[in-house]
């Protein structure tokens, strides 16, 4: 089981949208995948995916989860507030047929205060 998370760094403006992506790959098929997003070590959500669907669509304050086959788990924060700033980690574990687990590298989210004199959002793209 491999987990690749991106972007490494994400800087957005307060009130806008932030998208964090977790790519989950395994050479063999799986029946149920447990996923988890944490922020600064605290669990935001811990749903599972089975039959192509997420058991939960929300993830923390203003967070929405989606699963796009074959491998992309997306956490969308909208609207972003200042307290969304932090270090996000995606973790995944195949529960069926056999326990396998892996986690991504940290995504550091920086939220700039809403200031009309600043440039528009700078959203990094997911590598690969």
């Amino acid at each position: 089981l491999s987990v690749q998370q991106g972007p490494n760094l994400l800087q957005v403006r307060q009130g806008s949208q932030a998208t964090l992506v977790c790519q989950v790959d395994q050479a063999t098929a799986w029946e149920r995948l447990r996923v988890k997003w944490t922020k600064d070590g605290a669990i935001l959500c811990q749903p599972y995916i089975t039959n192509g669907s997420l058991s939960l669509g929300v993830c923390g304050p203003q967070g929405r989860l989606s699963w796009q086959a074959p491998s992309h788990l997306t956490l969308q924060l909208d609207p972003v507030s200042l307290n969304h700033s932090g270090a996000y980690v995606c973790w995944a574990a195949v529960e069926i047929p056999e326990l396998e687990e892996a986690e991504g590298n940290i995504t550091r989210l920086f939220v700039d205060p809403d200031d009309p004199t600043q440039n528009r959002n700078r959203i990094a793209s997911f590598p690969g």
Epitope: S2, D25, Q26, T28, A29, W30, T50, N51, A69, S71
Partner: antibody, heavy 120, light 113 residues
Amino acid sequence: QVQLQESGPGLVKPSQTLSLTCTVSGFSITTGGYYWSWIRQHPGKGLEWIGYIYTSGRTYYNPSLKSRVTISVDTSKNQFSLKLSSVTAADTAVYYCADMADKGGWFAYWGQGTLVTVSS
Amino acid sequence: DIVMTQSPDSLAVSLGERATINCKSSQSLFSSNTKRNYLNWYQQKPGQPPKLLIYHASTRLSGVPDRFSGSGSGTDFTLTISSLQAEDVADYFCQQHYETPLTFGDGTRLEIK
């Protein structure tokens, strides 16, 4: 360019242990998300998956051979190895090493294969 | 274990004609989670290791001639060579990676008529 090369004795006596090594060049076997695999092919026949070892060190074996198989990795030499104990004539085959990635699920790179004959 | 059954065992086709090889699995290789079929096709020429042609049942590996195509889903799969060339003479194997143990078909020997 990734290359794999099998090495080891071509003749093994019955009841002994078959030992083969696969040397990987052009790629580090410590790279995450890869399965380092052994596959064999009996003369004139189909392919049989023996097992593989994941980057984490976790091993997966074919249940038909599990009691006799050990796959291990030597990261310092960028090699992985196969040991098959208590061999019989039925273990005579061409043995291949190959790699498989989580992002694919297919055997992308193969060694050229080495014929191992079990005979007294 | 998932049993992979290939047919025919051998096949003789004239140059420029179509060759069709079938592969049937004892259980579905389609995952509703990833929307993928866990089925690969390999070509093996004498004295050489197998070479990947098609993955996920229908995706042709980069560099593989477009006369090779894969189709099917679930339990029934087909490898088609639209116009046989002399260099296509080889053994062809299907392989499932839906679950371990990974298993291969027994192979189809393709020859020129």
